[in-house]
Interface confidence: low
Amino acid sequence: LSTCKTIDMELVKRKRIEAIRGQILSKLRLASPPSQGEVPPGPLPEAVLALYNSTRDRVAGESAEPEPEPEADYYAKEVTRVLMVETHNEIYDKFKQSTHSIYMFFNTSELREAVPEPVLLSRAELRLLRLKLKVEQHVELYQKYSNNSWRYLSNRLLAPSDSPEWLSFDVTGVVRQWLSRGGEIEGFRLSAHCSCDSRDNTLQVDINGFTTGRRGDLATIHGMNRPFLLLMATPLERAQHLQSSRHRR
Amino acid sequence: LSTCKTIDMELVKRKRIEAIRGQILSKLRLASPPSQGEVPPGPLPEAVLALYNSTRDRVAGESAEPEPEPEADYYAKEVTRVLMVETHNEIYDKFKQSTHSIYMFFNTSELREAVPEPVLLSRAELRLLRLKLKVEQHVELYQKYSNNSWRYLSNRLLAPSDSPEWLSFDVTGVVRQWLSRGGEIEGFRLSAHCSCDSRDNTLQVDINGFTTGRRGDLATIHGMNRPFLLLMATPLERAQHLQSSRHRR
Amino acid sequence: ALDTNYCFSSTEKNCCVRQLYIDFRKDLGWKWIHEPKGYHANFCLGPCPYIWSLDTQYSKVLALYNQHNPGASAAPCCVPQALEPLPIVYYVGRKPKVEQLSNMIVRSCKCS
Amino acid sequence: ALDTNYCFSSTEKNCCVRQLYIDFRKDLGWKWIHEPKGYHANFCLGPCPYIWSLDTQYSKVLALYNQHNPGASAAPCCVPQALEPLPIVYYVGRKPKVEQLSNMIVRSCKCS
């Protein structure tokens, strides 16, 4: 796989340097470097340096450039899905159905069957089928964290809609955690966003799998469309292949 | 700038097709196509098709692949900053400092001076210097919307820290709105995240520019580091150049 | 990844990011950029062999797709993958300006 | 952007995304991929002229950087910019599998 052309590295560097000359001027829309005749003597003003430093420094919460794709991401991912534990399961008895929240629990043995090792998981999405929604609703997703505490994960502003629509939340990190832990059933909570001074905190959005008084003949369709985790993972045998090939370079 | 080599499009297509043959097999880690001897007759099982469709369909809230950089983003952005109106301004009198919120107002005439046209703005960040923080704090950012209402913008989970740290919130859309409107003073509210069943909704985080009883000789440094908007925008003259060149292609 | 961590510490002959520091004064003869004095621009270089034909369907070649032709191009090419912006300070007349130039620093390369 | 909207409706000679539909059965002779039957793979093609030398410092050339050499490469190359994944269904023995292959569909190209 070698190439027979010898590369003149110095020539390439010179061409790159000259290209950068053009690139910078081009990005600034300058035909030539600006005149320096009027530039005041002395150091740069403090305010300008402060501004330059603000721009240069990456700060908390600012999104970095997208990371280069890790080697493992090149390979295909097997896709599986794990349905939410049905709502008649005893796990739900512990959590009183409130007006502001619904609870979704998952069987981690099913998750482990789909993804035997946490490191194999490349993406996990929680998918919910939201039914009609009359008013805009701001919802929040929480992860069951310890005995009686919940950890905030993300939020979504749901626009009113006349038709059902799938919602997707990226829960890769959470599912990876679950795969590392010994718990049997792990869960999420979807809640109305409650601001510190708001009055009405009712969860208006209707998520398929939780509505009551459903006609018997619709039960199966309804059950199939209940919340699920969509998992994308490297199959175990491919991962082993990948690990052994990683030592070559 | 033309090239004199004529390209054999059919040859390129054939090479691409053959490369895809290798790519697919390589991504699946297969040395050759899998045997079809055991494949059951008839159509694919419903569950498999449902899974395939879940994977294929993009759903609400799922992040798409990063968009290609628009032409305008290629060019350099001028960076400016607008400091928050000082807290002794009368605008703050209306908003009682509560335990769960702090308020930040900005002079839109200063914003317009920096960015004469909303379309020129490519990024606006609200930057806050958070001082030491003893406990983890979940905060939310709101935009002043109408007389007494606030619109939720985003949230952040702040980790405990012994040293001051800059926080950044992307508020491009909001600032673009402000530039299009006639208001003189516009504002943000930073609040503690209040979950529907939480007890303590106190904003624990200390933001530079709001602490009281400060020594006089520190006031200037303190004032310089008060919340500000960092703006990145295409300078007006470059934008005009850009518009005229847009018609060429 | 063909990034600075890997490429700067190896003698990789194939596609990799290569070190290149640009000193505005020395390399470009420019005094008009006041900050920074220069930057690590880097560049991508090295072959991305075309590694598929009907008579080469075997595992050894397939395993090399990842590095040499992940995009299954008809003519794979060594190009930047992760890029970072560069803020600069310069004067227009008497007025100092801070501007951010996008995609100026090459952090990693890929065959594409 | 050098995307399908622009390139498929123009006669652009320089770097652009070109149409290419792969029919698994016809083009690759494969019957083992059950879904989809084929996909719009597309590809990037066209020159990215190197457009800078010390004697060409004028606006017309500078304006072309954006298209022809935005990354200021020493040898700019026409490569994919936006890519999309492809899910497929195939069997391993009696077991159907759904797998997602990353970066399979070229939506736009760039000189890099």
Epitope: S109, R112, G182, E184 | - | - | -
Partner: antibody, heavy 122, light 112 residues
């Protein structure tokens, strides 16, 4: 042969701290989840804490949550239990255990250490 | 928490006879994977506990076949046939179906 040897038990005053160690040998330590179980004088067994093989996740019984911290050093094949704000009811023999997960087809503790005595008294 | 109630609290057996210990759970110990994670342990006088039975009826390695576990749901039994002097000690049932994990109160077996 699998061996688990606890150490660090002592007499300590209420409110004090203690760090127990468990040296493991005879198996690939980093592949197994590990637990601590205690036995108060003349009483039965009480599960206290668990840690995953990587050390990434820890579990505690309610009565010790926030006071005890389980950790491990896979390079040293050692399991730890840092016990702070000790109370008289924490007096017990503390055992270190190897847990075989359900994924490993058991879901039970297969090996126990000999135990180390912790006495909390003024 | 899941309560495990053992009975009897103690029993005295002549060598060669059989002994039976009961363990009742406050809820079914059948896990959602269909398995029941109930185990039996023996703590001989002055010694550490040792595993006898896991998943209701599986003997741990090195455990003699005179120890037999049975039961399902909430009711479980450990039977020792042909008791030997070395079987003396406290027997505990333990569940690892639900978190937090629980042990029974123990049954003391005395050899007369």
């Amino acid at each position: 042969e699998v061996q688990l040897v606890e150490s660090g038990g002592d007499l300590v005053q209420p409110g004090g701290s203690l760090r127990l160690s468990c040296a493991a040998s005879g198996f690939t330590f980093s592949s197994y989840w590990m637990d601590w179980v205690r036995q108060a004088p003349g009483k039965g067994l009480e599960w206290v804490s668990r840690i995953t093989n990587s050390g990434g996740t820890a579990f505690y019984t309610d009565s010790v949550e926030g006071r005890f911290t389980i950790s491990r050093d896979n390079a040293k094949n050692t399991l730890y239990l840092q016990m702070n704000s000790l109370k008289s009811e924490d007096t017990a023999v503390y055992y270190c255990l190897r847990y075989i997960t359900r994924a490993q087809l058991m879901g039970a503790w297969d090996y126990w250490g000999q135990g180390t005595q912790v006495t909390v008294s003024s | 928490a899941t309560m495990l109630t053992q009975s009897p609290g103690s029993l005295s057996v002549v060598p060669g006879e059989s002994a039976s210990i009961s363990c009742k759970a406050s809820q079914s110990l059948v896990h959602t994977d269909g398995k029941t994670y109930l185990s039996w342990l023996l703590q001989k006088p002055g010694q550490r506990p040792q595993l006898l039975i896991y998943q209701v009826s599986n003997r741990a390695s090195g455990v003699p076949d005179r120890f037999t576990g049975s039961g399902s749901g909430t009711d479980f039994t450990l039977k020792i046939s042909g008791v030997k002097a070395e079987d003396a000690g406290v027997y505990y049932c333990a569940q690892s179906t639900y978190y937090p994990y629980d042990f029974g109160s123990g049954t003391r077996l005395e050899i007369r």
